[in-house]
C-alpha cells in the first residue's frame, strides 16, 4: 500500500528506479481506497516526465518505459488522478508523487581544467607543491563510492608524486634543469576508491622547470691567444674570450675581469648584449721593451643569490698570451726641441750644436737629417749644425728652424724637432743719435743758454743697462761757440758758450760729438750736430725757426 | 709522450744555404708556438727563432734575421728552418724547441742536430 | 736586448752540498718572466724553473727558483750525482736570451 495513512489528501511515499536500465522497471502501484476492485475506478498520469513512466489504468502499477540518467533528471515529479468511469468524475482530488532516479556507476571521472601546465624552480627540495588537479564525477556523491575518487600517477616517477586524496603533486627527486626543462606527468582518478567495477580518466600535466642559478660559467678555452700591435691607442679593443653559463636568461649574465696583470697593461670589459669578454689595452704597448703578456682572467655571475653561492666557489679563470706586433716606428729625438746658442759675427762654417735622433726598433737605422728654416744653416749626417752665413743679431736674434729625420733604410719613417737658435750679441755697433736733431740758436742768444739735449742709442743688446759717454770732439776747434756737457744719465746737453750769434755772417755751426758706449772692448762713433742760427726776434724763441727755415729754403723772406 | 727530432744538419760552405726540420709527435702539433735556439761549440744557448701556433707571427734574432726564415707544416707535424747565407759563426748545433702552453719557457727540446759551416 | 750575467762561471762543489747560482739582468724583467735550465754534456737543456718560481713537471722539490726584478737565484738544497751540470738562466719578458751559463762540477 503506497498511500499514506492521512486520508484528507494523497501524499505518496517516494518511489525509486534504477537508472540506465534498458528492461521496463515496474516502481509500484497507486490505489486509491475508494477502489472495491470492481474496475470502475481509472489511474491517470499527469506532469512533466510523465511520458517516461506509464500507468496501468486499472491496477495503478507504474512502470518506467524507457532508460533514464540520473545525471540529466535525477527526480520525477509525477500528478496522480482517480476516475471513477462510472460517472465520469474525478473521485479524490490530483495528487503529486515523486519517482527518485537512483544512481549507478556510470560516469568516469573528469579533469574540467584542462589543460595543467605547472612551473617549478630546478632543484627543489623533495615534498615541494607543484599543482593541483580535481576530477568531476558526475555521479551521485552521496550514493556509496560511485563518485569517490582516487589519485594515482601513471608516468612522472620517480620525479613526481600524488596525494590519492587531493590530486596534489608534489617533487619526490630533485631536478636539473640543464639536464630535462620539461616534463609531462599523467594522473588517474579512479571512483568507486579503486575498487573492482571502477571507472578512470587521466589528465596530462606539463611541467616546467624553471632556472636557478646553480652554474657558474666556465671559460670555452684554457688557453687565448691574442696579437696587439704596438701602434695601437690606449682604449683599443684587441680581442675577445668567452665563457659559457649552463643557465639561462639572468642567471647566465656575467662580468668578466682581470685576476692577474702585473704589467697593468691591459683590462677586461663585459659585453652584457654577447657575453664576451673584450680585452682592452690600458697602456700603450712597446715591442722594443717587452714583446709579449700574459694576463690571467676571471669569469662570475652577475646575480648570485647567498643561498646559492656553493655553486659559485671557485671562479672560472683563462690564461690570456698577448703577442705584441712590431711596427716601423719613425726615428725618436732625444729632445722634444733644442735650444742652440751663436756668437754673432762668427765666420761660415761654424757649429752651431747637434741634434740626436735614434731608430727605437731593434735594428737601429742610421738617420739622414734635413733642415729647413733658414739658409743661413746647414746639417750633416751626424746632426750636426753649421752656419753658411755670418750671423748678424740685429739683423735677427733667432732663428726657428725643423730639422727632419728620415730612417736610411726606410726613408718613409720621418721625424722632426724645432730647433731654436739664439744669436748672442758681441758688440759689434757704435752708438748714435737716438734721432735726426735740428737745432737751432737764435741770434740774441745768451751765454750758457741750453741749445739741445741729445741722446744716443745702440744697437747692440746690452746685459746690463747701456751707458754712453759723450764728448765733444777734439778736431772740432772751430765750434768754441758751443760746449757740451754729459749729464751721465746717456743724455747730454748743448750750450751756448757765448752771447750773440750773427745769422748773415755764420748762419750754421757744425758740432762733432763723439759718443762711446760702455762695452768691452769699448765703441764710439763720431755725430755731427748741425746748429743753425736763426732770428728770433726778442722773444728769443726758437719754435718759428723750422718754419722760418722752410720759407728760406722756398725762396721767402721773413721780416 | 712528447717527442722532437731534428734532422737536416751537415757541413755546408759558406754562402749556402741548408734546410732543417724537426719531428713533433705525441701532442697537439699545432696548438703550441715553436722555437730553434742554437748552441756553437763549446759557447752557451742562443735563441734563433719562434713561430706562432698558427705560423701566422714569426719573430727571428737580430742574427740571423734576413737570412733564416721559420716555417710549420701542421698536416706534418713538423718545423722547418731555411738557412741561407750561411756563415761560419753559424755552426752551432741546432735545437727545437716548445714553447709551455701557459708560459714562453721551453718544455721539450730535441736532441739537436749539427750545422758546421766552413770552406 | 736584456742580457742575462750568471755567476758563479763554475762552482765546485761535493754531493750532498746546497748550490746556489746566481743571474742578473740588465733591465727588470716584467712578470718574473725567468726560467732556469740545465744542460748534461751531450744532451739537450732540461727545463727546471719557469715564471722564477715555479718547479717544471718532474722536476724534484730539492730544485727551487727565487727572485724578482734584475736579480734571480736557483737553489739545489742537496747536490746528486745527476745534478753535475751547465745550468742556464733564461729571459721571456722580452724576447728571449739565455745567461751564459753556470758550471756545476763535482769538487
Known amino acids: 500500500d503506497y498511500k499514506d495513512d492521512d486520508d484528507k489528501a494523497w501524499v505518496w511515499r517516494p518511489f525509486v528506479v534504477l537508472e540506465e536500465m534498458d528492461d521496463i522497471q515496474c516502481v509500484g502501484k497507486l490505489r486509491s481506497d475508494l477502489d472495491n476492485g470492481n474496475n470502475s475506478f481509472q489511474y491517470k498520469l499527469l506532469g512533466i516526465g510523465a511520458g517516461s513512466f506509464s500507468i496501468n489504468e486499472r491496477t495503478g502499477e507504474i512502470c518506467a518505459i524507457q532508460k533514464l540518467d540520473r545525471e540529466e533528471k535525477s527526480l520525477y515529479i509525477l500528478r496522480a488522478q482517480v476516475i471513477d468511469t462510472t460517472i465520469g468524475k474525478a473521485v479524490e482530488t490530483e495528487s503529486e508523487f515523486v519517482i527518485r532516479v537512483l544512481d549507478i556507476n556510470d560516469n568516469e571521472p573528469k579533469f574540467l581544467d584542462e589543460p595543467y601546465e605547472a612551473i617549478v624552480p630546478e632543484m627543489s627540495p623533495e615534498g615541494t607543491l607543484v599543482i593541483q588537479v580535481t576530477a568531476s564525477d558526475a555521479d551521485d556523491p552521496s550514493s556509496g563510492n560511485n563518485a569517490r575518487l582516487l589519485y594515482s600517477l601513471l608516468q612522472g616517477q620517480p620525479y613526481f608524486s600524488v596525494e590519492p586524496t587531493t590530486g596534489v603533486i608534489r617533487i619526490s627527486s630533485k631536478m636539473d634543469r640543464e639536464l630535462q626543462d620539461e616534463y609531462w606527468v599523467i594522473i588517474q582518478a579512479k571512483d568507486m576508491i579503486g575498487q573492482p567495477g571502477a571507472l578512470s580518466g587521466t589528465t596530462s600535466v606539463l611541467i616546467k622547470l624553471s632556472d636557478v642559478n646553480d652554474n657558474k660559467p666556465i671559460f670555452k678555452e684554457s688557453l687565448y691567444r691574442l696579437t696587439v700591435s704596438e701602434s695601437a691607442p690606449t682604449g683599443t679593443s684587441i680581442g675577445t674570450i668567452m665563457a659559457y653559463d649552463n643557465d639561462i636568461g639572468e642567471n647566465a649574465e656575467m662580468d668578466y675581469s682581470i685576476e692577474e696583470d702585473d704589467s697593468q697593461t691591459f683590462d677586461i670589459i663585459t659585453n652584457h648584449e654577447t657575453q664576451e669578454g673584450i680585452v682592452i689595452l690600458k697602456k700603450k704597448v712597446d715591442f722594443e721593451h717587452q714583446n709579449h703578456y700574459g694576463i690571467r682572467a676571471k669569469v662570475k655571475n652577475h646575480h648570485v643569490p647567498e643561498q646559492l653561492m656553493k655553486y659559485h666557489t671557485e671562479a672560472s679563470t683563462t690564461f690570456i698570451k698577448i703577442q705584441v706586433e712590431d711596427v716601423d716606428e719613425p726615428p725618436v729625438f732625444l729632445l722634444p726641441y733644442y735650444i742652440l746658442e751663436i756668437p754673432e759675427g762668427k765666420p761660415y762654417g761654424t757649429i752651431v750644436g747637434t741634434v740626436s735622433a735614434t731608430d727605437p726598433d731593434r735594428r737601429q737605422s742610421p738617420m739622414r737629417y734635413y733642415l729647413t728654416g733658414s739658409k743661413m744653416f746647414d746639417i750633416n749626417d751626424n746632426g750636426t749644425i753649421i752656419t753658411t752665413n755670418m750671423l748678424d743679431r740685429e739683423v735677427s736674434a733667432w732663428y726657428n728652424l725643423t730639422v727632419t729625420a728620415t730612417e736610411t733604410y726606410n726613408v718613409q719613417q720621418i721625424s722632426s724637432a724645432h730647433v731654436y737658435v739664439q744669436v748672442f750679441n758681441i758688440n759689434d755697433n757704435a752708438p748714435e743719435f737716438s734721432q735726426f736733431y735740428e737745432t737751432y740758436v737764435c741770434e740774441n742768444a745768451e751765454s750758457g743758454e741750453i741749445v739741445q739735449i741729445i741722446s744716443a742709442i745702440d744697437r747692440d743688446e746690452s746685459i746690463e743697462d747701456h751707458h754712453f759717454y759723450f764728448n765733444h770732439s777734439l778736431e772740432d776747434t772751430n765750434n768754441s761757440s758751443f760746449m757740451l756737457t754729459d749729464n751721465q744719465d746717456n743724455t747730454a746737453v748743448i750750450l751756448s758758450n757765448r752771447t750773440g750769434f750773427n745769422l748773415k755772417e755764420e748762419p750754421v755751426f757744425y758740432m762733432i760729438i763723439l759718443i762711446a758706449d760702455n762695452g768691452i772692448p769699448s765703441l764710439t762713433s763720431t755725430n755731427t750736430l748741425t746748429i743753425q742760427v736763426c732770428d728770433c726776434g726778442d722773444s728769443r724763441n726758437t719754435e718759428t725757426c723750422a718754419n722760418k727755415g722752410l720759407l728760406f729754403i722756398m725762396g721767402f723772406r721773413t721780416e | 709522450q712528447v717527442q722532437l727530432v731534428e734532422s737536416g744538419g751537415g757541413v755546408v760552405q759558406p754562402g749556402r744555404s741548408l734546410r732543417l726540420s724537426c719531428a713533433a709527435s705525441?701532442?697537439?702539433?699545432?696548438?703550441?708556438?715553436m722555437h730553434w735556439v742554437r748552441q756553437a761549440p763549446g759557447k752557451g744557448l742562443e735563441w734563433v727563432a719562434v713561430?706562432?701556433?698558427?705560423?701566422?707571427?714569426?719573430y727571428y734574432a737580430d742574427s740571423v734575421k734576413g737570412r733564416f726564415t721559420i716555417s710549420r707544416d701542421t698536416s706534418k707535424n713538423t718545423l722547418y728552418l731555411q738557412m741561407n747565407s750561411l756563415r761560419a759563426e753559424d755552426t752551432a748545433v741546432y735545437y727545437c724547441?716548445?714553447?709551455?702552453?701557459?708560459?714562453?719557457?721551453?718544455?721539450?727540446w730535441g736532441q739537436g742536430t749539427l750545422v758546421s759551416v766552413s770552406s | 736586448e736584456i742580457v742575462l750575467t750568471q755567476s758563479p762561471g763554475t762552482l765546485s762543489l761535493s754531493p750532498g752540498e746546497r748550490a746556489t747560482l746566481s743571474c742578473r739582468a740588465s733591465q727588470s724583467v716584467s712578470n718574473t718572466y725567468l726560467a732556469w735550465y740545465h744542460q748534461r754534456p751531450g744532451q739537450a737543456p732540461r727545463l727546471l724553473i719557469y715564471g722564477a718560481s715555479s718547479r717544471a713537471t718532474g722536476i724534484p722539490d730539492r730544485f727551487s727558483g727565487s727572485g724578482s726584478g734584475t736579480d734571480f737565484a736557483l737553489t739545489i738544497s742537496s747536490l746528486e750525482p745527476e745534478d753535475f751540470a751547465v745550468y742556464y738562466c733564461q729571459q721571456y719578458s722580452n724576447s728571449w736570451t739565455f745567461g751564459q751559463g753556470t758550471k756545476v762540477e763535482i769538487k
Open positions: 724547441a716548445r714553447e709551455r702552453y701557459f708560459d714562453w719557457s721551453f718544455d721539450y
Open positions: 713561430i706562432s701556433y698558427d705560423g701566422t707571427n714569426e
Open positions: 705525441g701532442f697537439t702539433f699545432s696548438s703550441y708556438d
